[in-house]
């Protein structure tokens, strides 16, 4: 069964936390539907974001922050590992210094942390997706 | 009660005939949600569009057309009516020379047609956006 | 073995124009974010501003903006810091600094420090 | 305005513990370091994201942070660590700043 979009739920990541996503593009890649994850520093989604990741399919990924209400510098990635109307699955793993990304299993992109994932209180996955899995895994300690 | 999203309908306009679509940004403005509303020549989404109208909620609407499956030249407006948070009701009507966009009663866009209103043969909205109401009336002849 | 050698300071006077350079060699200059250090006679150590790896993101200490501009040149492996309309408390000696990855990241600190070059500001 | 307060001295005995405070950084979000700077010579990194060791640093060098307050810690401390410590954290992540500086003396 369908999940919300937007879907927000609340986290808490560290190193070896890995965050879950199943879904499947609303629209054909000729008509550029998005996809964007946010790890947000408090509930509220006007707040700080520490890891944004966008999909615009079939053309880009960019990466970013938002500190103190302001974007910083964006990474941008012509890999597009996603498939024209496929489900998707999408890992995002908390290494000690950066995020990895992960399609299908393959690795895609990283993005250095700026911001502690420590710091992050929510995740939300939202725009033109249908939404069918999203699950945080913690480190067994 | 909500519309699906995205919403679409078959739909033959003329001069006089008016899209009138009322819905809600999903997410405040801080985070761009988007509003896209396609006027298609065919009922599939791949199909070409011969009056595409999309907001970034809070930055632009850009407006444009796809012809033989390619974008053509972009008319670009910082004219920013909509309210953060708030509903919207947006009325597109079909004169004999452009299209003029209402908000909230305002006029606030028009463009140029390129392509007779009379190829079209399908509307699509869709974005972040919840959908309340999708009217298409047509000029008593 | 990574080197970043400074040169361009001197004695100014108060209003006037300095440009720094940096030449760097021992790595790939290219790849990696830069800054300018800057530390008083005695005292201690603020940082003045950085710049990307590819050059299109800058930032700047509040004190120096609008007055001082960062830049590179990867082909030449040198940074730069223009630096006008200057004031007796930009006196200091000037550190170029390499950053361990492409971004400004405050993340890997500053791996490489230069010698310093000293600018004096005084009529 | 964002400040980094270190305490300007600390003195410690030949063979032990210094601990050198940072405090008012946001290190709940954002990493700190520390460079040993001694007199005439450029600053050199000791500590990078909280606790990492760049090679070449002797292993008694270590870091930590909580909340508030980062701190350095010098376990067994030798003559030659005598020097000038800096605190660095960012203010975002593009944007950097450095702590007062403190004087560690070894007795």
């Known amino acids: 069964s369908l999940l919300p979009v937007p879907y927000t739920e609340a986290a808490s990541l560290s190193t070896g936390s890995t965050v879950t996503i199943k879904g499947r593009p609303l629209a054909c890649f000729l008509n550029e539907p998005y996809l964007q994850v946010d790890f947000h520093t408090e509930m509220k989604e006007e707040s700080d974001i520490v890891f944004h990741f966008q999909v615009c399919f079939g053309r880009r990924v960019v990466m970013n922050s938002r500190e103190y209400g302001a974007w910083k510098q964006q990474v941008e990635s012509k890999n597009m590992p996603f498939q024209d109307g496929q489900e998707f699955e999408l890992s995002i793993s908390v290494l000690p210094d950066k995020y990895q990304v992960m399609v299908n299993g393959q690795s895609s992109y990283t993005f250095d942390h700026r911001i502690k994932p420590e710091a992050v209180k929510m995740v939300q996955v939202w725009r033109d997706i249908s939404l069918t899995k999203f699950n945080v895994s913690y480190l067994k300690r | 009660s909500l519309l699906p999203v995205p919403y679409t309908e078959a739909a033959s306009l003329s001069t006089g005939s008016t899209v009138t679509i009322k819905g809600r940004p999903l997410a405040c403005f801080l985070n761009e949600p988007y509003l896209q509303v396609d006027f298609h020549t065919e009922m599939k989404e791949e199909s070409d569009i011969v009056f595409h109208f999309q907001v970034c909620f809070g930055r632009r609407v850009v407006m444009n057309s796809r012809e033989y499956g390619a974008w053509k030249q972009q008319v670009e407006s910082k004219n920013m009516p909509f309210q953060d948070g708030q509903e919207f009701e947006l009325s597109i009507s079909v004169l004999p020379d452009k299209y003029q966009v209402m908000v909230n009663g305002q006029s606030s866009y028009t463009f140029d047609h390129r392509i007779k209103p009379e190829a079209v043969k399908m509307v699509q909205v869709w974005r972040d956006i919840s959908l309340t109401k999708f009217n298409v009336s047509y000029l008593k002849r | 073995e990574v080197q970043l050698v400074e040169s361009g300071g001197g004695l100014v006077q108060p209003g006037g124009s300095l440009r720094l350079s940096c030449a760097a060699s021992g790595f790939t200059f290219s790849s990696y974010a830069m800054s300018w250090v800057r530390q008083a006679p005695g005292k201690g150590l603020e940082w003045v501003s950085a710049i990307n790896s590819g050059g299109g993101w800058t930032s700047y200490v509040d004190s120096v903006k609008g007055r001082f501009t960062i830049s590179r040149d990867n082909a030449k492996n040198t940074l730069y810091l223009q630096m006008d309309s200057l004031k007796p408390e930009d006196t200091a000696v000037y550190y170029c600094t390499k950053y361990s990855g492409p971004e400004l990241n405050t993340q890997y600190g500053m791996d490489y420090w230069g010698k310093g070059t000293l600018v004096t500001v005084s009529s | 305005n964002f400040m980094l307060t270190q305490p300007s001295a600390v003195s410690v005995s030949l063979g032990q513990t210094a601990r050198i405070t940072c405090q008012g950084g946001n290190f709940g979000s954002y990493y700190a370091s520390w460079y040993q700077q001694k007199p005439g010579q450029a600053p050199v990194l000791v500590i990078y994201?909280?606790?990492g060791r760049p090679s070449g640093i002797p292993e008694r060098f270590s870091g930590s942070s909580s909340g508030d307050t980062a701190t350095l810690t010098i376990s067994g401390a030798q003559a030659e660590d005598e020097a000038d410590y800096y605190c660095q954290s960012g203010s975002s992540s593009d944007n950097t700043v450095f702590g007062g500086g403190t004087h560690l003396t070894v007795l």
């Open positions: 994201r909280d606790s």
